[in-house]
C-alpha cells in the first residue's frame, strides 16, 4: 500500500535569465528512493538520480540544470520557454511510483519584480 | 568466493564488432548493477558502461555511446559488452566490475579480457 | 563530464613514509568518490568509498578525507606491498570518470 506523499514547490515564478530550484520531497513512507526522474512539460527528460550511479543529465540540458539541493534540480539561464509544468517522478521501493507536479512561470525581469513587490506575505 | 571472469577478447579489424561476456558466481547477481572498464595499455582506467539489475538503466561513456550496448541475461549470471565499429582507441584491457550496493565504489573486478584493434 | 586531477602523477617513497595523494573534482561532488589501488599485471582494488569509509579487509593505515572538489587519499606508513599505482574514481555523475593515476614508487 502506497502511504507517501509527495510534497512541491508549487506553482512557482522566476526572472528571464535567472534560476529556479525545483524541490520535491516524498514525506511519510519509508519506501526505499531507488530513482528520481526529473521531466518537461513536453515530457522531456531534464535529468535523473539514480541511487545506484548519481545524477545524469540529459545532453540538452546540461548547460543549465545544476543537480541539487538534494534532489532536487536548479534550472539556470532561464528562457520564456520554461514556462509550464515540471515533474518529479520517484521510483521506490516497496511503495512504487509517486509523483509531483510543479509549475513555473518565467516573467519578463520588470515583471518579476513588479509581481514579487506585491506578493502577500 | 565472489568471482567475474571475462571472454571474447581478442584482435580485431577496425570497423568490426566482438561480443565480450563476464560470468558471475558467489552473488546475487539478478539484484546487482555492473559495469564495464577498459584500460588502454600503460594508460588509466575509463568507465565504459553500467546495466541495473533488471537490465534496465542502461549508460554509456561519450566515446562508446552508440557503438557499445551492454545487456546482460540474469538466468544464465551472464553480463555481456556487444562492441560495434571498433576503432583502434578502443584497444584495451576490459573488465567487468560490481559496485557495492548504493555506496557507488566497485568492489569485485575480473581479471579483464583483452581487445586489440588494428589493420 | 566531470574531470579529476590527480596530484602528484607519481610519487618516490620510502618504507614507513606517510604519503598524501589529492584529487581535484573540476565541479563538486559531494563525497561521492572513491580510491583504488592498482599492481601491475592485476585488476584494481576498491580502497576507499563515499570520500572515507574504508572498504572492508583494507588495513587501516590507509584513509579518505574532503568533499566537494578537494579530496585526498593518506597512507600512514608505507609498507612494502603498497608500492603500486592509485586512483579516484567519482559517482556523482554519469558517466563516472577516473582520474589519471599516482604511481607510488620505491625510493
Known amino acids: 500500500m502506497m502511504t507517501g506523499t509527495i510534497e512541491t514547490t508549487g506553482n512557482i515564478s522566476a526572472k528571464k535569465g535567472g534560476s529556479v530550484i525545483l524541490q520535491c520531497h516524498l514525506s511519510s513512507t519509508m519506501a526505499q528512493v531507488t530513482q528520481v526522474n526529473w521531466e518537461q512539460h513536453d515530457h522531456s527528460l531534464l535529468a535523473i538520480r539514480n541511487a545506484e550511479l548519481g545524477w545524469h543529465i540529459y545532453p540538452a540540458f546540461k548547460d543549465r540544470v545544476a543537480p541539487g539541493p538534494g534532489l532536487g534540480l536548479t534550472l539556470q539561464s532561464l528562457t520564456m520557454n520554461d514556462t509550464g509544468e515540471y515533474f518529479c517522478t520517484y521510483h521506490t521501493y516497496p511503495d512504487g511510483t509517486y509523483r509531483g507536479r510543479i509549475f513555473l512561470e518565467v516573467l519578463e525581469s520588470s515583471v518579476a519584480e513588479h509581481s514579487a513587490r506585491f506578493q502577500i506575505p | 568466493q565472489v568471482q567475474l571472469v571475462e571472454s571474447g577478447g581478442g584482435v580485431v579489424q577496425p570497423g568490426r564488432s566482438l561480443r565480450l561476456s563476464c560470468a558471475a558466481s558467489?552473488?546475487?547477481?539478478?539484484?546487482?548493477?555492473m559495469h564495464w572498464v577498459r584500460q588502454a595499455p600503460g594508460k588509466g582506467l575509463e568507465w565504459v558502461a553500467v546495466?541495473?539489475?533488471?537490465?534496465?538503466?542502461?549508460y554509456y561513456a561519450d566515446s562508446v555511446e552508440g557503438r557499445f550496448t551492454i545487456s546482460r541475461d540474469n538466468s544464465k549470471n551472464t553480463l555481456y559488452l556487444q562492441m560495434n565499429s571498433l576503432r583502434a582507441e578502443d584497444t584495451a584491457l576490459y573488465y567487468c566490475a560490481k559496485p557495492v550496493p548504493r555506496r557507488r565504489g566497485l568492489d569485485v573486478w575480473g581479471q579483464g579480457t583483452m581487445v586489440t584493434v588494428s589493420s | 563530464d566531470i574531470q579529476l586531477t590527480q596530484s602528484p602523477s607519481s610519487v618516490s617513497a620510502s618504507v614507513g613514509d606517510r604519503v598524501t595523494i589529492t584529487c581535484r573534482a573540476s565541479?563538486?561532488?559531494?563525497?561521492?568518490l572513491a580510491w583504488y589501488q592498482q599492481k601491475p599485471g592485476k585488476a584494481p582494488k576498491l580502497l576507499i568509498y563515499?570520500?572515507?569509509s574504508l572498504q572492508s579487509g583494507v588495513p587501516s593505515r590507509f584513509s579518505g578525507s574532503g568533499s566537494g572538489t578537494d579530496f585526498t587519499l593518506t597512507i600512514s606508513s608505507l609498507q612494502p606491498e603498497d608500492f603500486a599505482t592509485y586512483y579516484c574514481?567519482?559517482?556523482?555523475?554519469?558517466?563516472?570518470?577516473f582520474g589519471g593515476g599516482t604511481k607510488v614508487e620505491i625510493k
Open positions: 546495466i541495473g539489475a533488471d537490465g534496465s538503466n542502461k
Open positions: 565541479q563538486g561532488i559531494s563525497s561521492w
Open positions: 563515499g570520500a572515507s
Open positions: 574514481q567519482q559517482a556523482f555523475y554519469l558517466p563516472w570518470t
Open positions: 558467489g552473488f546475487t547477481f539478478s539484484s546487482s548493477y
